[in-house]
């Protein structure tokens, strides 16, 4: 025998109390499969959430961050404050990045400059707690004597075209 | 159901003190740092304080550091803030709200927040 609940569609459900017919959901919940028992509840958006998607009666209501936070986790289950470029957040609220680390955004972490002398280069542009910092060329390549004119490119024969 | 329910707005002049309720239900308070939330009109929203589990960590954004104290009576499942001191650039609709799970640690994210109460300082 066929369950009779089978043929109740999304945004139904299967009423117990009424000879197992289908009943709409009820307002503010939603089925968004067929055969269902119960209507679940929307879920609400409201203080630091603000409505993306209205709840429907076969789908549930999506919610991002009022402006000032940014959305955290999947379907936006938190909203985590946003700070300036050149801050990071911790317990205390928004922080200015210590000196010798920079984020160039509104959320994360403050991260160090990156360290040019590792890669054998110097420091072109110096870092801020907005921006890294650039690197340049290596030391060697400015070191006294060392040309800094770009070499001439090799002659090609007349009647030649480029590669 | 969890929910969050604020009240004790309302108009006050400026210099004037107001005392916010929050009163926390279907979770267990005792578990959860909690925040104070504003947003005043036309503007973004801003945090304002918080408060571990059991009260002995309290931070404030530095525009309400000592004129406002957020406390929490975790036995009445009650959160609050005591604000006095009161200036028009206070006016905003407040909101408590619930650190997620990990806040502090891995996050600063809130997860659940309530329908606000509206303080209007004006003379």
């Known amino acids: 025998l066929q369950d009779p609940c089978s043929n109740c569609p999304a945004g139904t459900f299967c009423d117990n109390n009424r000879n197992q017919i289908c009943s709409p959901c009820p307002p503010n919940s939603f089925s968004s499969a067929g055969g269902q028992r119960t209507c679940d509840i929307c879920r609400q958006c409201k203080g630091v959430f603000r409505t993306r998607k209205e709840c429907s009666s076969t789908s549930n209501a999506e919610c991002d961050c009022t402006p000032g936070f940014h959305c955290l986790g999947a379907g936006c289950s938190m909203c985590e404050q946003d700070c300036k470029q050149g801050q990071e957040l911790t317990k205390k609220g928004c922080k200015d990045c210590c000196f010798g680390t920079f984020n160039d955004q509104k959320r994360g972490i403050c991260r160090p400059w990156t360290n040019c002398s590792l890669d054998g280069k110097s420091v072109l542009v110096n870092g801020t707690k907005e921006r890294d910092v650039v690197c340049g060329p290596s030391p060697a390549d400015l070191s006294p004597g060392a040309s800094s004119v770009t070499p001439p490119a090799p002659a090609r024969e007349p009647g030649h075209s480029p590669q | 159901q969890v929910q969050l329910v604020e009240s004790g707005g309302g108009l006050v002049q400026p210099g004037g003190s107001l005392r916010l309720s929050c009163a926390a239900s279907?979770?267990?308070?005792?578990n959860y740092w909690m925040n104070w939330v504003r947003q005043a009109p036309g503007k973004g929203l801003e945090w304002v304080a918080n408060i571990n589990q059991d009260g002995s960590e309290r931070y404030y954004v530095d525009s309400v550091k000592g004129r406002f104290t957020i406390s929490r009576d975790n036995a009445k499942n009650s959160l609050y803030l005591q604000m006095s001191s009161l200036r028009a650039e206070d006016t905003a609709v407040y909101f408590c709200?619930?650190?997620?799970?990990?806040?502090?640690?891995?996050?600063?994210?809130?997860?659940?927040s309530g329908q606000g109460t509206t303080v209007t300082v004006s003379s």
């Open positions: 709200a619930r650190g997620g799970e990990g806040y502090g640690v891995d996050h600063y994210g809130l997860d659940v």
């Open positions: 279907g979770f267990t308070l005792s």
